[in-house]
């Protein structure tokens, strides 16, 4: 789970150790704050749960790519 260290900054201190299916993911945001000890990605699931993930892992990068493509393709 992400931790808010103050009102403005959210950091991740641990990463999920299991791969999450892209079908369960709604969005993501990158955590690249100089106030955080680790660079991270926070995925938001379709049930609004936030999960910290390691951006160096291939499944994380693939999931971000998938979500990027979803946002680029207008829903008809």
């Amino acid at each position: 789970q992400p931790d808010a260290i103050n009102a403005a900054v959210t950091c991740c201190y641990n990463f999920t150790n299991r791969k999450i299916s892209v079908q369960r993911l709604a969005s993501y945001r990158r955590i690249t704050s100089s106030k955080c000890p680790k660079e991270a990605v926070i995925f938001k699931t379709i049930v609004a749960k936030e999960i910290c993930a390691d951006p160096k892992q291939k499944w994380v990068q693939d999931s971000m790519d998938h979500l990027d493509k979803q946002t680029q393709t207008p829903k008809t």
Epitope: T32, K35, P55, D68
Partner: antibody, heavy 121, light 111 residues
Framework: QEQLVESGGDLVKPEGSLTLTCTAS?????????MCWVRQAPGKGLELIAC???????TYYASWAEGRFTISKTSSTTVTLQMTSLTVADTATYFC??????????????WGPGTLVTVSS | AYDMTQTPASVEVGVGGTVTIKCQAS???????LSWYQQKPGQPPKLLIY???TLASGVSSRFKGSGSGTQFTLTISGVESADSATYYC????????????FGGGTEVVVK
Amino acid sequence: QEQLVESGGDLVKPEGSLTLTCTASGFSFSTSYWMCWVRQAPGKGLELIACISSSIGVTYYASWAEGRFTISKTSSTTVTLQMTSLTVADTATYFCARTTDDNWNVGFNLWGPGTLVTVSS
Amino acid sequence: AYDMTQTPASVEVGVGGTVTIKCQASQSIGNRYLSWYQQKPGQPPKLLIYGTSTLASGVSSRFKGSGSGTQFTLTISGVESADSATYYCQQGATISYLDNAFGGGTEVVVK
């Protein structure tokens, strides 16, 4: 006003070492930023070397710089870059740059004028 | 890897014209993680645009950034002689990978 000034650039022999200093004024590192060293060889493009969090000291390096370059925060207003085993390919103007705020994705809005490092026998 | 590649390497444009510079990422960096800089000889770079499309403080609205995923564009309209410079893109997606974070640069020559 907010300012960065690099110092320590010099003519150095191959295999030599050098330490560059970036001195900040008009702001303090207690406000968190990414402080980075960027270099530019004569007539070439920009190359990121290393970055450090001004508040907590977390560091990141380009893969080619790891082991040979060391970025450090030495006071509340200075960041250094220690360079070892220098080669002719390290000849460049070295810039100190600061991100607009604590996030990496907002770009560098503050740059020093640069300091020239020449590696030659 | 998030390697940035810029095209063209050089472009010539007349005063009042429009110039388009492209920046390609080797993998998707999302829609708000790209910055653009202008650099004139003997000077440090100047931030023009961050977050793909947000103008930095004091930058003319003649500069426009757009794009998402792997393809990004800087458009300069109503080109002025003062726009003669080299322009660089930079990925802001990850600080863990600093190699080739900047594009190779595009020299804009105003005729």
